[in-house]
């Protein structure tokens, strides 16, 4: 019963933090404008992994697709690749995970199987889940960089008359979505792989009973009974469901509404 | 067709308030910011302060805090200034104005003078 | 607050000649987000409300005639008049729409030499 519920937990949780790392890779508030120096701005800028954003007093936002792979810098490009394959292998993961779960009964699958699967699932939310912190983690840095940088050369005087304020970029909301995502696909995979050796039947060799009867005698031996845990020679070949994500640049989105000042 | 319809010139006392309104038709009323502008005879523009009709989000000329309070009233389409502790100096002609793209005030009232004997 | 200063105060142009208005920030109305001068022109005549001529810097606003131009970048803009015609003797406001608060150049009176 505890094995159930650990591995049907690990599962919910798993798929709630990818449903997570889902939203953060689409979010187009990774890096928002600061506003420290100017709390109420006129013209807000905000940015993504596909594209950046420009939202007015007026109430319209302005977003344009970032439209070329070479002009992108090396590390938004390593960032949509973490949290790419961090989607891919959760995606592959809970397919597996589904096939896995104690509550859901296919065939005359074995424990030993669900067992091997439902590891397996729990492997690929830890590796999903590592990717997505690595990645979110990889961006904070480059922002933190990039913060430390514009602030040294923030105010550059012409004749000492007229300022030009370099834009200042700090973390936005979808850093913050994807490091829980991330924590949450993680911990999901640590409750499977935890949920997998319950499931794996022990291996338990009974030893022989004679029983002396009147009149003649039988011996009950019951044959050592060996359950394979998946691991050994003995597993069975089973096709692990193989997904694949697929992302495409955003389409250049024309002026949106937007709800606030 | 846009339309923004200001009420009537206003006479008051000093120390006195007057509310001003902008009842806007021909457009999604919650779907652009309204803007009001002040003009002193012979002078220049001077930005009061901003509203989103949408959810009645406010940004002030700190100049004019204090002195502006804008509302709005969605189920009439209206957008309202109120201003208090009316001075001499207040005399003006008050503008409501649609802003569009860019932040530009693509659409105005005819505008609605604002009196107030020294 | 952004300061914005136009130039000339005043200005007296024969019809069909060319009128040039300029206006100056005391900061940088470019957004880096877009690559868009948040700089806007205005002409009021007497009476009456002012009309957005120009936003952008250089976007001419429907119903515009092309006759009115804004270009400009950064901290230095200029509205043209490549012909003038007897309804374009006005003032002419420009406006930072950048930063809070607004801001208004003091206005630039045409008139008819």
């Known amino acids: 019963m505890a094995v159930t519920a650990c591995q049907g937990l690990g599962f919910v949780v798993s798929l709630i933090g990818i449903a997570g790392i889902i939203a953060a890779t689409c979010m187009d508030q990774w890096s928002t404008q600061d506003l420290y120096n100017n709390p109420v701005t006129a013209v807000f800028n905000y940015q993504g992994l596909w594209r950046s954003c420009v939202r007015e007093s007026s109430g319209f936002t302005e977003c344009r697709g970032y439209f070329t792979l070479l002009g992108l810098p090396a590390m938004l490009q390593a960032v949509r690749a973490l949290m790419i394959v961090g989607i891919v292998l959760g995606a592959i993961g809970l397919l597996v995970s589904i096939f896995a779960l104690k509550c859901i009964r296919i065939g005359s699958m074995e424990d030993s199987a669900k067992a091997n699967m439902t590891l397996t699932s729990g492997i690929m939310f830890i590796v999903s889940g590592l990717c997505a912190i690595a990645g979110v983690s990889v961006f904070a840095n480059m922002l933190v960089t990039n913060f430390w940088m514009s602030t040294a050369n923030m105010y550059t005087g012409m004749g000492g008359m007229v300022q030009t304020v370099q834009t200042r970029y700090t973390f936005g909301a979808a850093l913050f979505v994807g490091w829980v995502a991330g924590g949450l696909t993680l911990i999901g995979g640590v409750m499977m792989c935890i949920a997998c050796r319950g499931l794996a039947p022990e291996e338990t060799n009974y030893k022989a009973v004679s029983y002396h009867a009147s009149g003649h005698s039988v011996a009950y031996k019951p044959g050592g009974f060996k359950a394979s845990t998946g691991f050994g020679s003995n597993t069975k070949n089973k096709k692990i469901y193989d997904g694949g994500a697929r992302t495409e640049d955003e389409v250049q989105s024309y002026p949106s509404k937007h709800d606030y000042v | 067709e846009v339309q923004l319809q200001q009420s009537g010139a206003e006479v008051k006392k000093p120390g006195a308030s007057v509310k001003v309104s902008c009842k806007a038709s021909?457009?999604?009323?919650?779907?652009?910011?309204m803007n009001w502008v002040k003009q002193a005879p012979g002078q220049g523009l001077e930005w009061i302060g901003l509203?989103?009709?949408?959810?009645?989000?406010?940004s002030y000329n700190q100049k004019f805090q204090g002195k502006a309070t804008l509302t709005v009233d969605k189920s009439s389409s209206t957008a309202y200034m109120e201003l208090s502790r009316l001075r001499s100096e207040d005399s003006a002609v008050y503008y409501c104005?649609?802003?569009?793209?860019?932040?530009?005030?693509?659409?105005w009232g005819a505008g609605t003078t604002v009196t107030v004997p020294s | 607050d952004i300061v914005m200063t136009q130039s000339p105060d005043s200005l007296a142009v024969s019809l069909g000649e060319r009128a040039t208005i300029n206006c100056k920030s005391s900061?940088?109305?470019?957004?880096?987000?877009?690559?868009?001068?948040?700089l806007t022109w205005y002409q009021q005549k007497p009476g009456q409300p002012p009309k957005l001529l120009i936003y952008?810097?250089?976007t001419r606003e429907s119903g515009v005639p092309d006759r009115f131009s804004g270009s400009g970048s950064g901290t230095d803009f200029t509205l043209t008049i490549s012909s003038l015609q007897a309804e374009d003797v006005a003032v002419y406001y420009c406006?930072?729409?950048?930063?809070?608060?607004?801001?208004f150049g003091a206005g630039t009176k045409l008139e008819l030499k």
């Open positions: 900061q940088s109305l470019l957004n880096s987000g877009n690559q868009k001068n948040y």
């Open positions: 406006q930072n729409d950048y930063s809070y608060p607004l801001t």
């Open positions: 021909g457009y999604s009323f919650t779907g652009y910011t």
């Open positions: 104005a649609r802003m569009n793209y860019g932040n530009a005030m693509d659409y």
């Open positions: 952008w810097a250089s």
């Open positions: 509203i989103n009709p949408y959810n009645g989000g406010t």
